[in-house]
Interface confidence: medium
């Protein structure tokens, strides 16, 4: 995410539009306690963090409260007086949402109706995935809102589903991360299952009316 | 389809204000910022500054204490004001909409000069 | 503030010809670098994003490589519509900075 200035790597996560969590890697500084400072514009003062994260006893990153921010995070990581990295980025593009919270199934018949609860701020695609014992890799469908209808399933076999966010690329950039998938849900025949067989099961013969 | 359209005077008297609108359609404001840059053969492309879509700011250093951009999202359109302009100030300023690192979209330019 | 250098301020070609353009950076900016097409009459336009990314509606003619402090961007099989003057743009870190521009001419 930035070039290495004196050897140095970060790596920035704006958790949910709730925290960013900057992080530094920097193989000469690997035992110095590297100090973080930042600002959210340009012509204030910078503060130092107050919640570092630690690394095997050393400074590695630090963790900020910046809730609903669009704008930019002036930063310094320094040794001592000595800036080793300075840089300023957008902090919502290292938009990480966060995993979909109360997701639901609604059947009927050959399709499912896949929701859960919209994340308060928008410019997000929510992805379900889907897959089958038969199935050789997972199938993908992905909505504006939490509603997301998959059709033409096989009411008679198993499947898993999980559901994540994404942020749309021509608003947030190329930068962001998706969201932890959900838990694996599996149902069949509208029901829920503890988890879809690793085989495929023979389809039962039908009988005859 | 994407539009940023400017309108602003092309002429302006030494230590006075330069004020140029940029109406934008097919996008909305409260979405995208918009960011102004100026084109002089002395000094090239330079970036002066932008809005945010929350109606925040940013400004070039150089630029900081005689530049102010404003919004109105409700008609769409950003407000460039830059006062105590010189001679070198005479230059094509352009509005851009911002789409992540990049100005993905530009007005048609105001060029301006400063003369009395 | 990060200097954007593009050492050719000039280049004539011909029609059909494959045209290479340079863009250095005075430190490393990732791969947070823009090129842009700018006409005769004035107007801009977006070409590449993000390094080699095309933006839409651009012909695939164009393309873009690099990463770091060096860039380039390539024209393969110019055409009379390519005749303009190409800019490079950092967005890596505030202010944005320019390339002093390459304007490319027919010969």
């Known amino acids: 995410q930035g070039g290495a200035a004196e050897g140095v790597q970060i790596q920035i996560i704006y958790f949910n539009l709730e925290t960013v969590q900057v992080t530094w890697n920097a193989s000469k500084y690997s035992r110095t306690n590297l100090t973080f400072h930042y600002r959210f514009n340009g012509d204030e003062a910078y503060d130092q963090c107050t919640n570092y994260l630690l690394q095997e006893g050393h400074t590695s990153g630090c963790l900020l409260d910046a809730e609903q921010r669009d704008d930019i995070l002036y930063f310094s990581i320094r040794n001592g007086t000595h800036p080793v990295f300075t840089a300023s980025r957008w902090m919502v593009y290292y938009l990480k949402p966060s995993s979909p919270k109360h997701v639901r199934f609604s059947w009927h018949q050959d399709a499912v109706t896949v929701t859960c609860s919209d994340l308060s701020y928008g410019d997000l695609l929510y992805e379900v995935q889907y897959r089958s014992p038969f199935d050789t890799e997972w199938q993908s469908k992905q909505e504006n809102t939490c509603n997301v209808t998959i059709e033409g399933l096989d009411a008679e076999k198993c499947y898993s589903f999980w559901v994540r966010v994404k942020a749309m690329e021509d608003v947030y950039g190329p930068d962001t991360y998706p969201s932890d998938w959900s838990e694996v849900t599996c149902w069949q025949r509208g029901e829920i299952r503890d988890a879809c067989a690793e085989t495929p099961t023979p389809p039962k013969p039908k009988l005859s009316k | 389809q994407v539009l940023l359209k400017q309108s602003g005077p092309s002429l302006v008297q030494p230590s006075q204000s330069l004020s140029i609108t940029c109406t934008v359609s097919?996008?909305?404001?409260?979405?995208?910022?918009v960011h102004w840059v100026r084109q002089s053969p002395g000094k090239g492309l330079e970036w002066l500054g932008v809005?945010?879509?929350?109606?925040?700011?940013d400004y070039n250093a150089a630029f900081m204490s005689r530049l102010s951009i404003t919004q109105d999202n409700s008609k769409s359109q950003v407000f460039f004001n830059m006062n105590s302009l010189q001679s070198d100030d005479s230059a094509i300023y352009y509005c851009?909409?911002?789409?992540?690192?990049?100005?993905?979209?530009w007005g048609q330019g105001t060029s301006v000069t400063v003369s009395s | 503030d990060i200097q954007m250098t593009q050492t050719t301020s000039s280049l004539s070609a011909s029609l059909g010809d494959r045209v290479t353009i340079s863009c250095r950076a005075s430190?490393?900016?990732?791969?947070?670098l823009n090129w842009y097409q700018q006409k005769p009459d004035g107007t801009v336009k977006l070409l590449i994003y993000?390094?080699?990314r095309l933006h839409s509606g651009v012909p695939s003619r164009f393309s873009g490589s690099g990463s770091g402090t060096n860039f380039s961007l390539t024209i393969t099989n110019l055409e009379e519509e390519d005749i303009a003057t190409y800019f490079c743009?950092?967005?890596?870190?505030?202010?944005?900075?320019f390339g002093g521009g390459t304007k490319l001419e027919i010969k």
């Open positions: 851009a909409k911002k789409a992540f690192y990049v100005m993905d979209y």
């Open positions: 097919g996008f909305s404001l409260s979405r995208y910022g």
């Open positions: 809005i945010w879509r929350s109606g925040s700011t």
């Open positions: 430190q490393d900016i990732s791969i947070y």
């Open positions: 993000y390094t080699s």
């Open positions: 743009q950092q967005g890596n870190t505030l202010p944005w900075t």
